[in-house]
């Protein structure tokens, strides 16, 4: 005749796909010290065990290597360890202690294991800031993964120049040497749990610090269309009295500080405008000459100059004599 005992703890446990769970089981205190038998965990309904310490009994194909009976009769332990949880593990389980020498066995109550979709996602950590041209180590980690599970497979996707660094069961390191053009591009860490056939990923946008590479001046003359200067220009003819708006813009991350100087400034010169915009409401002789826009950045500066050449209005010139 079968003797029954109650599994301690909750009637159901939840585990996420690909992860691990321990189904607790303690042998009944009434079990005689002389009782010698084998332990078997069964999925409710199926008569092939999912885990056992009986060398003559083979377990289910689906659970082989993933389900383990943690058998320690002296400590009354009969717990079931499940790793690489799969959707099909979602079921009720019970434990049976059977002896080939005793007339009776022990059967536990049922416990349900609920396998949920994996909601955890990998973490990507970046030490400090990413600087153009400087290698940095990025770490993709899955701290919620159990050590005894099948190690996950890490894969990285990025347009930036990279090389793989060391990895552990729970993390992978990627060395990245970003370029200015890699700023705002995506970097993805994908983690696959081969034991359960589940893949999770996290994508971040790279924030790459880089000095300005390009500085340009847009020129607005009265109501006429703007034109852009991308390199130092020897001279730009402007009509006397005309309103001129010079707009400087530069790349760089974080954005460079833009300022305007008249002439070719020394490092500590005082700017005539502390923004990228220089308004010249009426061009006259005072404005003839060079104007320089400087893009200042912690990682380096860049500047561009243009030379204004003033055309005098004929009547204005005659009236002045």
């Amino acid at each position: 005749q079968e003797r029954r005992f109650q599994l301690e703890g909750p009637e159901s446990l939840t585990v996420q796909e690909g992860l691990c769970v321990l189904v607790p089981c303690r042998l009944p205190t009434t079990l005689p010290a002389s009782y010698y038998g084998y332990g078997y965990w069964f999925l409710e309904g199926a008569d092939v065990p999912v885990a056992t310490n009986d060398p003559d009994e083979e377990v289910q194909e689906e659970t082989r290597g993933r389900f383990h009976l943690l058998w320690d009769p002296r400590r009354k332990n009969c717990s079931l360890s499940i790793r690489d949880a799969r959707r099909r593990d979602n079921a009720a389980y019970f434990f049976r202690l059977k002896s080939k020498w005793m007339k009776y066995g022990y059967t536990s109550s049922k416990l349900s294991v609920r396998v949920m979709a994996l909601t955890h996602r990998p973490n990507i950590s970046i030490p400090g800031t990413l600087e153009s041209g400087h290698p940095s180590n990025l770490t993709c980690s899955v701290p919620w993964v159990c050590e005894q599970g099948t190690p996950p497979i890490f894969s990285w996707m990025s347009a930036a120049p990279t090389s793989l660094g060391p990895r552990t069961t729970q993390s992978s390191v990627l060395t990245i040497t970003p370029r200015p053009q890699d700023h705002s591009t995506n970097l993805t860490c994908q983690v696959t749990f081969p034991g359960a056939g589940v893949t999770m990923e996290r994508t971040i946008q790279l924030n790459v610090s880089y000095a300005p590479q390009k500085v340009a001046i847009s020129i607005f003359q009265g109501n006429s269309a703007a034109f852009k200067i991308l390199q130092n220009t020897s001279s730009l003819p402007v009509l006397e009295g005309q309103a001129l708006r010079l707009l400087c813009d530069a790349d760089g991350n974080p954005p460079a500080h833009l300022s305007w100087f008249q002439g070719f400034p020394a490092l500590n010169a005082t700017p005539i405008s502390n923004t990228g915009v220089l308004e010249l409401p009426q061009v006259g002789s005072a404005e003839e000459g060079d104007f320089t826009c400087r893009a200042q950045h912690p990682l380096g500066s860049l500047q561009i100059s243009l030379s204004l050449f003033v055309h005098w209005k004929p009547e204005g010139r005659a009236g002045g004599v």
């Epitope: 409710e44 092939v48 689906e62």
Partner: antibody, heavy 121, light 106 residues
């Protein structure tokens, strides 16, 4: 839908051997042992034994040890039973059956349609 | 091994009549299961865990009992109920069956 499809009727001579099959479908073959049950004409049912499809491990009713041999082909989800040294006592319908094994009880939940064995000279 | 004794071996009942058949066990078991078998077909699980009806089994069937005495009851006999009913235990190995009760329609 769970199905157990058994091979057709057999007419064999005394002393000979016979091998019958049971093809399973509609469930994971390796999750359940395959059981065999004998029903002599107009008589009750007797459990012969079972086989674990994962390793071919068998368990027999003492009465049928030496008479029946259970084997399995995992790749085709088919179980076999060979009966040897046949006598008229072995004339019967033989069923393969799947067992429901629960924490509180155990019974046969699915049966094959049966293979009729007639031993006659 | 555990011996199951079914009685009566054969019985007949008229439509609408209440039918009870019993299964006595040589030593106490936790549960009893019943199978229905009609001529030329394989047994069908009919009642399991002593009192639970298998799917598709009419509600006029019921099962009860404990220990060494179990029974199957039909509250109101119908023609389609004519069959042989076997009790079965699996509280200990090997699993054993009763010799069956053949129920005929009067």
């Amino acid at each position: 839908e769970v199905q157990l499809q058994q091979s057709g009727p057999e007419l064999v001579k005394p002393g000979a051997s016979v091998k019958m099959s049971c093809k399973a479908s509609g469930y994971t073959f390796t999750d359940y042992k395959m059981h065999w049950v004998k029903q002599s004409h107009g008589k009750s049912l007797e459990w012969i034994g079972n086989i674990n499809p994962n390793n071919g491990g068998t368990s027999y009713n003492q009465k049928f040890k030496g008479k029946a041999t259970l084997t399995v082909n995992k790749s085709s989800s088919t179980a076999y039973m060979e009966l040897r040294s046949l006598t008229s006592e072995d004339s019967a319908v033989y069923y393969c059956a799947r067992r429901y094994y629960g924490s509180s009880s155990s019974y046969f939940d699915y049966w094959g349609q049966g293979t009729t064995l007639t031993v006659s000279s | 091994q555990i011996v199951l004794t079914q009685s009566p071996a054969i019985m007949s009942a008229s439509p609408g009549e209440k039918v009870t058949m019993t299964c006595s066990v040589s030593s106490s078991v936790s549960y009893m299961h019943w199978y229905q078998q009609k001529s030329g077909t394989s047994p069908k699980r009919w009642i399991y865990d002593t009192s639970k009806l298998a799917s598709g089994v009419p509600a006029r069937f019921s099962g009860s009992g404990s220990g060494t005495s179990y029974s199957l009851t039909i509250s109101s006999m119908e023609a389609e109920d004519a069959a042989t009913y076997y009790c079965q235990q699996w509280s200990s190995n090997p699993p054993t069956f009763g010799a069956g009760t053949k129920l005929e329609l009067k």
